[in-house]
Each structure stands twice: as C-alpha cells, then as structure tokens.
C-alpha cells in the first residue's frame, strides 16, 4: 500500500483540506470520492457540481483538495482511489466540530432570599460533540448536573445548578462556562445574583469620642442598619425600662443629655425589612464625674491638664475598663 491519507478535523464553516498522497508514483490515476462514493475529482477534473471543492494540487504523487464552508453534512469517509495493479483505496475521515449555537443562563428567581436554594440552568445549544459546562460563583467552581439531548448528530447540553444563597452572594456573578474543541478561549455567560437578607445592625458611639460616659456628659449613639432591601424601620428602645425623659430620638440617632446613674441600662436598636428583623444592644454605664483638685498657686496650664488627666485615671478605678461600655449585635 503506497496510498496515504490523513483524518481531518474541522470547525463548521471553516476549510478542510483532503490530501491523497502516493509514495511511489507510477503516473497512475488518482480519484477522490465523497461519502456517497460520488467522484469529487478524477485527476484534476471535478465532475461534481459542489464548487466548495477546489483543487489545491494535482501531480502524479498527490491530489490535494480543499473543501470550504464545511457543514455537518460533509462529515464522513472520503475515498482516495489509486488505479495501480491491483487498485488501492484509502479513506480519510472528516470530522466536523460545531461550536454551541447559543449559550443561555436562566435563574429560577430574579431575587432570592438568604438561605434559600435556587435553581440555575445553563443551556448550550446544538454543538458537536457535546459541550462540557462548568459553573463558577465568582472565582469558586461549583458542581452542576448535566443532561445531554441528541438530535440529528447535534447535542444540546443543559446543566442544572442548585445553589444555596447567602447574603455575601449578593452582586456576585454566577458564571456558566463552556469547554468545547471548536471554541478557543472562554465562552461564558453570567448572571449576577440578587440576594435579599435581613438587616445587620451595628451601634456606633459618636459622642463622647474617648468612649467614657460620665455623669453630666452627653451621649450620642448612631444605629447603622444594612440589609436588602434597605431597612424601612429603625427604632430605639430601652430594654426592660422606659426610655429616659431627656432622651431625644432622631432617625437612627439616640441623644441623651446630662447623663446620670439612672440612665444605666441596655439600649436596643431594632431594624427590619421584608426579610426579617434584627437588633443590636448597647449597655450604658454612667461613670462618676472626674475628681477635681484645687488649682496650684502657680498655674501651668499644660501641667495642670496633664496632672488632671493622671489624677482622673488614678481616682476612678474603672476609668480604663473599656469592657464596661459594650455594644452587642443580634
């Protein structure tokens, strides 16, 4: 056997090159036939009407033909015939790769609630061979379940991903990425998750700045509530007691002027949205006012200030205990 061919793999729409090569040429006739055994070329003559076949080279040692705009129907065995004694026949198989026609991602719900499990489907339509679908949530790969449907030598792959969503997933892309021999680089489609979650409540003490609350001082607390949708209700209550008469509520802020020991207690900021309710507690402890010392005869402002500060710390045994002022989130 001195007639040789090579199998060809080509992407749909591109060009396939079929070559019939003769090792030891004796000027025998070379003929190329299609899978229906119709003659494409007899030597350098093409009787077949399909003008997508063009002669690239014809000699006693090679018949080389190009097939442009390859379609799936061109797939199959192409026969090279060499009329030696005895006649020789060799075949080349053309395999046509078809990239997925369409890539569609479908999320069961446009908006999900934290803790909920949602279904995400991705469909890669009409490819050959079947497409491999990979899932990513942000940069994290997830495992889906694929189903393959075959129709007329083409494959439609649908991959299902069951995803339990958390608040951190809000705004994160869910990516459907396909891997296919006819696709170079990344072919992917994505949808951004929209996750609703109950508020997260955090209390910030905006006054006094150094964090110590003393009798006669003022207190200002700000309640920060973040949720999706943004909380509609932010309220302040005093746990197990009435709110002091001199307390002032203004939106997310709580003001208490002229603190006294009776103001000690737990102050709660509550926030809610359509998903749920949450709160955070602030335990107020009002310290004694600082001990004052009569000013010395020679006044050095800087020294006095320094001395006062030192004396205060020494005098008030609880002055440094930050643990007595705490906010508890729930």
């Amino acid at each position: 056997q001195n007639l040789f061919t090579k199998d060809v793999t080509v992407i749909e729409g591109e060009v396939a090159t079929i070559s019939c090569q003769v090792n030891k040429s004796d000027d025998s006739v070379i003929q190329l036939l299609n899978p229906n055994r119709q003659t494409i070329y007899f030597r350098d003559f093409r009787p077949l009407k399909d003008s997508r076949f063009q002669l690239l080279n014809f000699s006693s040692s090679e018949l080389k033909v190009s097939l442009t705009n390859v379609s799936i129907s061109d797939e199959g065995r192409y026969f090279c015939q060499l009329y030696t004694d005895p006649p020789q026949e060799s075949y080349t198989t053309i395999t046509v790769l078809v990239p997925p026609r369409n890539l569609m991602i479908d999320i069961q719900k446009d908006t999900a609630v934290e803790g909920e499990e949602i279904e995400v489907n991705c469909t890669a339509m009409a490819s050959k061979p079947a497409t491999t679908i990979r899932w990513f949530k942000g940069n994290t790969e997830l495992k889906g379940k694929s189903e393959v449907e075959e129709w007329s030598d083409m494959y439609t792959v649908t991959s299902q991903l069951m995803l339990k969503v958390h608040k951190e997933d809000d705004g994160v892309p869910v990516i459907c990425q396909v891997e296919h021999p006819a696709v170079t680089g990344n072919l992917q489609t994505q949808r951004y998750l929209e996750v609703q979650y109950k508020p997260q409540v955090h209390i910030q003490m905006t006054y006094p700045l150094q964090g110590l609350t003393r009798e006669g001082d003022a207190l200002e607390l700000t309640c920060e509530a973040i949720g999706k949708p943004q909380p509609v209700m932010v309220t302040w209550v005093r746990v197990d007691d009435e709110m002091p008469q001199h307390a002032v509520l203004s939106g997310p802020n709580l003001f208490i002027n002229n603190l006294n020991k009776t103001d000690n207690g737990t102050y709660r900021c509550e926030a809610s949205n359509i998903v749920g309710k949450a709160h955070s507690d602030y335990m107020l402890y009002v310290y004694d006012p600082p001990t004052t010392i009569p000013p010395p005869t020679t006044t050095t402002t800087t020294t006095t200030t320094t001395t006062t500060t030192i004396l205060t710390i020494i005098t008030d045994s609880r002055a440094g205990e930050e643990g007595s002022i705490r906010a508890v989130d729930h």
């Epitope: 000027d27 003559f45 009329y83």
Partner: antibody, heavy 121, light 107 residues
C-alpha cells in the same frame, strides 16, 4: 492527433449479432485516464449510450440497463481497438453507431464519424 | 423517456444571445456536458464541467448550472452555430444519459 474509426457490416438480419470495431490512433485503449464507449443514434431514440470499457490497472465494463443482457464490449490491446457485440438484434436496433473516447467516465471529448447499421431481413 | 429534458427547438436572430437549457435530477449533483451536432456529422464536445471549453471552441459558447438545470449560452450567435445541441450527464444509477436534443435555428 487522436482519431477513432468504426467499422463493421452495415446490414444485420434480425435475431443475429451486430459486431462493430473501433480502431484507435494517437492514444492507447489501455490508457488509465480514458474510457472507450459505444453510443448509438436513431430518430426514434435520439442519442443512446450503450456501454464502455476502460482500464484502471484491470479492465472494467459498464453497460446500459436497456441492453445489458445482450451486449459485450471487449478491448483488444494488441490491435489497439475495442469492439461491440449486440446479440439478438431487432429493427429497433437500427441506428448510427458511434465509438467515443471519454475522459475518465465524465465527458466524450472525441467521437468517431459513425457507421449506420440497419437491422432488416 | 430521457432523464434529461431539453426544449425540442429554439431560434435566435443572428448576432443575438440564446440560451439552451437541460433539466434533470442528476444535474443537482453533476455538471452537464454539451455537444453540437451538425447534419451528417458526429457530435462535437463544446462545454464540459463547470464552464470549460475544449480547444477550438469559440468563447461565445459558455455553460452554467443552477439547481437541476444546466444551460448552454451562445452570445452573439453565428450562422454556423445552427445545429442540434445535446446535453449529457448521468442518471441516479450512474448510467450515461443524453437529453433529447434542441434544434437551434439562426435567423
């Protein structure tokens, strides 16, 4: 210059065998890129292909369905010619008989001048 | 009955263009060949393959093909083009078939 020349009797009796020869000059009957054909023409049937012989490392014959059971085409390499035998002829076989060279098995690029054969008693 | 169909007769004024057609299922796959035959003479190949002319055939002869129809066009017909024209291809079994012929008259 390639030439083809038909020869044979111009009159054949019904039920007998029609025999014709085509002499080739300027080409070889054993050419591996040609086929050698017999075609006939009559007013009632127009041009009608009868069959071919060709060499592609071995000899091949193709015959028209209409005459398959009673036709033989043979090459004669020693005389560089090919022949037609048509058995059991009837007046319907009366026609001008042409030998023709075919490129591959695709088109007739050269014809003989033709010979009229009449089938009559 | 022939598997290639041609109009029996076509006429053309001298110097004008004429198209002779040939129809058949096999022409969807294969090109037709065209032959010119003058009275008392053997047929002569004028067009083969996609649109190939053997040497000695004037360039006013051209061939084309679409679907199941092959056409022979003579652009600027001359008096000597008056003849019978036959198309040729193969049937579904691979047998050689000829059209019934078209008689071209040049007026």
């Amino acid at each position: 210059q390639v030439q083809l020349q038909e020869s044979g009797p111009g009159l054949v009796k019904p039920s007998q065998t029609l025999s014709l020869t085509c002499a080739i000059s300027g080409d070889s009957v054993s050419s591996n890129s040609a086929a050698w054909n017999w075609i006939r023409q009559s007013p009632s049937r127009g041009l009608e292909w009868l069959g071919r012989t060709y060499y592609r490392s071995k000899w091949y014959n193709d015959y028209a369905v209409s005459v398959k059971s009673r036709i033989t085409i043979n090459p004669d390499t020693s005389k560089n010619q090919f022949s037609l035998q048509l058995n059991s002829v009837t007046p319907e076989d009366t026609a001008v008989y042409y030998c023709a060279r075919e490129y591959g098995i695709w088109y007739f690029d050269l014809w003989g001048r033709g010979t009229l054969v009449t089938v009559s008693s | 009955s022939s598997e290639l169909t041609q109009d029996p007769a076509v006429s053309v004024a001298l110097g004008q263009t004429v198209r002779i057609t040939c129809q058949g299922d096999s022409l969807r796959s294969y090109y037709a060949s065209w032959y010119q035959q003058k009275p008392g003479q053997a047929p002569v190949l004028v067009i083969y393959g996609k649109n190939n002319r053997p040497s000695g055939i004037p360039d006013r002869f051209s061939g084309s093909s679409s679907g199941n129809t092959a056409s022979l066009t003579i652009t600027g017909a001359q008096a000597e083009d008056e003849a019978d024209y036959y198309c040729n291809s193969r049937d579904s079994s691979g047998n050689v078939v000829f059209g019934g012929g078209t008689k071209l008259t040049v007026l």
